[in-house]
Structure formats: C-alpha cells, structure tokens
Interface confidence: medium
C-alpha cells in the first residue's frame, strides 16, 4: 500500500522567511505519481494549492513552489514569504 507521510506534524514558521513542507512516499516511487497539495483552513475548506507540473490554484503561484525530490522520494512545498493568512493544515495527495 502507498502511504504519504508528512515530515513534521507541526511546522513553526516565521513571517517573511521561506518555509518548506515535505511529504514522504512510502511503498512506491514518487516519480510514478502526480503530487497534489491542499490547505485546510479553520472553516474546514480544502483549497487546492499545487499539482505537478507547475499547476497552481488561483492566487498561489506567486507565493508557493511545489516540487518533488526523486532521490529522497519526497514531495516538497515551499511557502516563499509566509504570512498569517498561510496558517492552516496542509495535505499532500497523489494520483496517477
């Protein structure tokens, strides 16, 4: 079975300082899948952020960078200049 595991359950972030979220794939090669990132905010709304390759949700392209690290079997999401509005729970998902 495939499992996507966040590197950290909680990521402390400083305003304006780039932050990186990582999600590790267990049981399969990450290169065989498309990775997606979502953010869930307090109102339980799930918002699409990024999908390979270079597909971003509205308003996310300028402040987020998604990528995969084939060597480490990781999905990576960078928040370039975090602010309070970026608070929330981030989810990685995969599909073919």
């Amino acid at each position: 079975a495939i499992e996507l595991v966040p590197e950290h359950q909680t990521v402390p972030v400083s305003i304006g300082v780039p932050a990186t979220l990582r999600c590790s794939m267990k049981g399969e090669a990450i290169g065989n899948y498309y990775i997606n990132w979502y953010r869930k905010t307090q109102g339980n709304t799930m918002t699409f952020i990024y999908r390979e390759k270079d597909i971003y949700g509205p308003g996310f392209k300028d402040n987020f960078q998604g990528d995969i690290d084939i060597a480490k079997n990781l999905a990576v999401l960078k928040i370039l200049a975090p602010s309070e509005r970026d608070e929330g729970s981030y989810y990685c998902a995969c599909d073919t």
Epitope: S14, I15, G16, V17, P18, T20, R22, D62, N63, Q65, D67, D69, A71, K72, L74, V76, K78, L80, A81, S83
Partner: antibody, heavy 119, light 110 residues
Framework: QVTLRESGPVLVKPTETLTLTCTVS??????????VSWIRQPPGEALEWLAH???????SYNSSLKSRLTISRDTSKSQVVLTLTNVDPVDTATYYC???????????WGQGTMVTVSS | QSVLTQPPSASGTPGQRVTISCSGS????????VNWYQQLPGTAPKLLIY???QRPSGVPDRFSGSKSGTSASLAISGLQSEDEADFYC???????????FGGGTKVTVL
C-alpha cells in the same frame, strides 16, 4: 524606480573591520516579499553570497564567514549594513548588495563597490 | 569552491545553440527553483531567468532555462556577439538558509 547603492571604504588595512552600507530606494525593507543579500566577487572569481536579512529582521550568514560577519538594517534610513571583521587581503573583492524579491530571485543589484585590503 | 557546479567555459559561433549545466543537491536545486544571472564584463550581475524557466521582461526569448531533479541548464539559441559574458546559476539552499551560486561559466562567441 528600485535602486540599491553600496558605499564604504575603498582601502582597508589587514585586521581592520570593514563596514559597508547599502542604501535602497523604491521599496520597503519591511515588505514581506522583499529582503536584501550581500554578495562579493574577488577579481576574476565567482560570486560568493555573504549574508541575508529578511523582512522580519531575521538574518542568515555564509557558514564559512559567519564568525566575522554581521548584517543589520536601519529601516528609517532604508539602509542595510554589513560588517566584516579582521579583514585579510583575500577579502579584496567587489561587494554587491541585491534585493531578493520572491519568487523572482535577486532582481535588482547595486553597481558594486571595490574594496582592497592591503597594508 | 562553489556549492553549485558549472563548467568554466562554453563557446559557439554566431547563430549556434549553447547549453550550460548547473549541478547541485537536494537541499538547493532539488527542493528550490533555479535562477540564472548574466554578468557582462565590468558590470553587476543581471537577472536572466527566474523560477527555473521564467524570463523577466526585456530578456530575449533566445534564453531559456530548465530544471530536472538536482540539475538545471541554461540554453542560448541563436548565439550573438553581445552574449559574451559570465553566466551564474543560483538557488536557495534550505540547509544554509541562503542563496548559493555556481562557479560561473564564461561564454565566448567565436
């Protein structure tokens, strides 16, 4: 129009402290998407990143020079100051400051200031 | 010793295509985007490519960038005499919490 201008001494003696000032205009040092780096380039050599100051005043340094470097800012004067202690002739270089504008990278550079370390 | 690795030189005749490679690691190119800078003789570096493959306004479309894994490349198609310059790749490094540069590639138009 965004500009950065480096200023400081042209000649410094070995063991002295070098102080360089980067005066910026056209953007705010506290803008969340803006930050400033110092980079140097010895004659005929590659670019070397020295230090970085983020919009929230956090700093990061080149690990090999960290003990000798200090970066700070004065937002009221729109200035970023770099100090390098105990200089040596190998510190002879052109020193640049550059704005980092995310996600665009270092999109505006100063013209650079040449510093020679010699007795 | 630069963190990112570039060939020291590259050359071509006018009109030719020249490609410059840039190799890094998972903490820089592997998890961040790559920028390219052009430095004409006696001048400050200028941003040429950002976010792997994006050109700032005013940069000719003869310049293109790409990235794969922990490596990136810059291509100059239709080489012109005014392209003689040093080209540097750069990327943010998560371990250093700062940008890292390549050693630079000097492009000569024969």
């Amino acid at each position: 129009q965004v500009t950065l201008r480096e200023s400081g001494p042209v000649l410094v003696k070995p063991t002295e402290t070098l102080t360089l000032t980067c005066t910026v205009s056209g953007f705010s040092l506290t803008n969340i998407r803006m930050s400033v780096s110092w980079i140097r380039q010895p004659p005929g050599e590659a670019l070397e990143w020295l230090a970085h100051i983020f919009s929230n005043d956090e700093k990061s340094y080149n690990s090999s020079l960290k003990s000798r470097l200090t970066i700070s800012r004065d937002t009221s004067k729109s200035q970023v100051v770099l100090t390098l202690t105990n200089v040596d002739p190998v510190d002879t270089a052109t020193y640049y400051c550059a704005r980092m504008r995310l996600p665009y990278g270092m999109d505006v550079w100063g013209q650079g200031t040449m510093v020679t370390v010699s007795s | 010793q630069s963190v990112l690795t570039q060939p020291p030189s590259a050359s071509g005749t006018p009109g030719q295509r020249v490609t410059i490679s840039c190799s890094g690691s998972t903490s820089n190119i592997g998890s961040n985007t790559v920028n390219w800078y052009q430095q004409l003789p006696g001048t400050a570096p200028k941003l040429l490519i950002y976010s792997n493959n994006q050109r700032p306004s005013g940069v000719p479309d003869r310049f293109s960038g790409s990235k794969s894994g922990t490596s990136a490349s810059l291509a100059i198609s239709g080489l012109q005499s005014e392209d003689e310059a040093d080209f540097y790749c750069a990327a943010w490094d998560d371990s250093l919490n700062g940008p890292v540069f390549g050693g630079g590639t000097k492009v000569t138009v024969l």
